[in-house]
């Protein structure tokens, strides 16, 4: 094995094309120089190597950079991505906005793994907080990113970047998440008028209070049952059933079939028989 | 040579679970990626999972993602394929097929075994 | 997702004739195309690779080509061991995704 360790003549790379899926596991580690590959990293992606040369071309670079890559380096790496760990990701300084993009890339249409995961979060701590443009690009390649973070952590999100928030990047957000968001939102969508206001605040409806559900039932914004399924019990709690008619507008009817669940059983089993009787829907508290 | 060999497939209920595995021999298991390719009586191949020659990275099509769990023991030369709440559309038979690097094609092809999902 | 469309999905020929399986991608994927060949009961078999590789130990009547999101399989001289089903497959760092196949029958 020990005169393995030398690149026999004439294999010594001079650069990185096809001719190295040829080259044994030893031979890649003896005659790829290392600066080499760094420089030309963008070309490994259209070389088909093998999963154990990649693992060669990985220790190269391990070896060049112990104190891990340069952003030059992480920005063209593609698939080679893939087989770093969290432990290797910690290490990088990754700041742009570019590179971030073309890692994600590499992943996108998968669940978020845990060097993706890493890599977001070495990035939003090198930057201090979410910004539009982060959160832009996070949750269109992950969805439910938002979701994902804990309140402590939403809540370095500046209320501007609230505006890159589509209703599907909520879906699963639990109450205490939306509790953090709402207020955001609500500074984010105040010069809207009424109508355009509640299409945006919608999706945060989940963390609204009473009184603010009380100021959207005079503005005849007809909400529909999905959107009052997930208001917070306490919030809808106090609300009268002139209120809620309002709120829902031609939705009110949809109260019925939702009887049995909350919030509405709560809210129900809080009214006057005689007041839930005006709305004619059978509703017995 | 290279051999891949799948068993466990048969008939099972809706709703529940089942566990392929497929043997390998004549190459070094260790290095290669391992997918699961299925195919529905009558109809086309389809591309179920693959999982990277480590076993840290494991990728799944849509229809089966949150149900079936790839995974690999390199020390028995074995890939496995957990499937859990099984519906009748999963109803195939299943190959599982070697691939060499990220870019290689499928190069290697077990039997298959067929799995029947019904009530 | 990538999807990949194959046409014809059925092909009537005769041994000794030229036939054409064309393949297109939803996007491009440069050279990263297979082609299988797979017998009724059988596993399928791997005939092209990077579009136009012929995988050891296939006759060389079999060729591919293109690039991009438009490739084709040829068969140049039909034989009677040839009467199969063929797919098409793009292939890349993490997912496969398969033609819907194309049936050569004896016409």
């Known amino acids: 094995e020990v005169e393995k360790t030398a690149c026999p003549s004439g294999k010594k790379a001079r650069e990185i094309d096809e001719s190295l899926i040829f080259y044994k596991k030893w031979e890649l580690e003896a005659c790829v120089d290392a600066a080499l590959l760094a420089t030309q990293m963008d070309r490994v992606n259209a070389i088909p190597f093998t999963y154990e040369q990649l693992d060669v071309l990985k220790h190269k670079l391990d070896e060049l950079y112990p104190q891990g890559y340069p952003e030059s380096v992480i920005q063209h790496l593609g698939y080679l991505f893939l087989k770093m760990s969290p432990e290797d990701i910690r290490k990088w300084n990754v700041t742009s906005l570019e590179t971030l993009k073309a890692l994600l890339e590499v992943n996108k249409g998968h669940e978020m793994s845990p060097q993706v995961a890493t890599l977001i979060d070495r990035f939003v701590k090198g930057r201090g907080q979410l910004d539009k443009d982060t959160l832009d690009t996070l949750t269109a390649f992950y969805p439910g990113y938002l979701c994902s973070l804990s309140p402590e952590e939403l809540s370095s999100v500046p209320p501007s970047s609230i505006w890159a928030v589509r209703p599907q990047d909520l879906d699963t957000c639990d109450p205490r998440q939306l509790d953090v968001l709402y207020p955001k939102a609500r500074l984010a969508f105040q010069n809207m008028n009424g109508s355009e206001y509640f299409v945006k605040i919608q999706s945060f409806l989940g963390g609204a209070p009473t009184e603010d559900l009380k100021a959207l039932s005079q503005q005849n914004v007809s909400m529909d049952l999905a959107t009052f399924m997930k208001l917070r019990t306490d919030a809808v709690l106090p609300l009268t059933v002139a209120e809620v008619q309002k709120l829902l507008g031609p939705h009110v009817e949809g109260l019925k079939a939702e009887e049995r669940h909350r919030p509405v059983r709560d809210w129900i089993l809080r009214q006057r028989q005689d007041d839930l009787d005006t709305l004619g829907l059978g509703l017995q508290g | 040579q290279v051999q891949l060999v799948e068993s466990g497939g048969g008939v099972v209920q809706p709703g529940r679970s089942l566990r392929l595995s497929c043997a390998a021999s004549?190459?070094?298991?260790?290095?290669?990626?391992m997918n699961w390719v299925r195919q529905a009586p009558g109809k086309g191949l389809e591309w179920v999972a693959v999982i990277w020659n480590e076993g840290s990275n494991k990728y799944y099509a849509d229809s089966v993602k949150g149900r079936f769990t790839i995974s690999r023991d390199n020390s028995k030369n074995t890939l496995y394929l957990q499937m859990n709440s099984l519906r009748a559309e999963d109803t195939a038979v299943y190959y599982c097929?070697?691939?060499?690097?990220?870019?290689?094609?499928?190069?290697?092809w077990g039997q298959g075994t067929l799995v029947t999902v019904s009530s | 997702d990538i999807q990949m469309t194959q046409s014809p999905s059925t092909l009537s020929a005769s041994v000794g004739d030229r036939v054409t399986i064309t393949c297109r991608a939803s996007q491009s994927i440069s050279r990263w195309l297979a082609w299988y060949q797979q017998k009724p009961g059988k596993a399928p078999k791997l005939l092209i690779y990077k579009a136009s590789s012929l995988e050891s130990g296939v006759p060389s009547r079999f060729s591919g080509s293109g690039s991009g999101t438009e490739f084709t399989l040829t068969i140049s001289n039909l034989q009677p061991d040839d009467f199969a089903t063929f797919y098409c497959?793009?292939?890349?760092?993490?997912?496969?995704?398969f033609g819907q196949g194309t049936k050569v029958e004896i016409k």
């Open positions: 004549g190459f070094t298991f260790s290095s290669d990626a």
């Open positions: 497959q793009q292939y890349n760092a993490y997912s496969r995704t």
């Open positions: 097929a070697r691939d060499r690097g990220p870019l290689w094609p499928l190069d290697y």
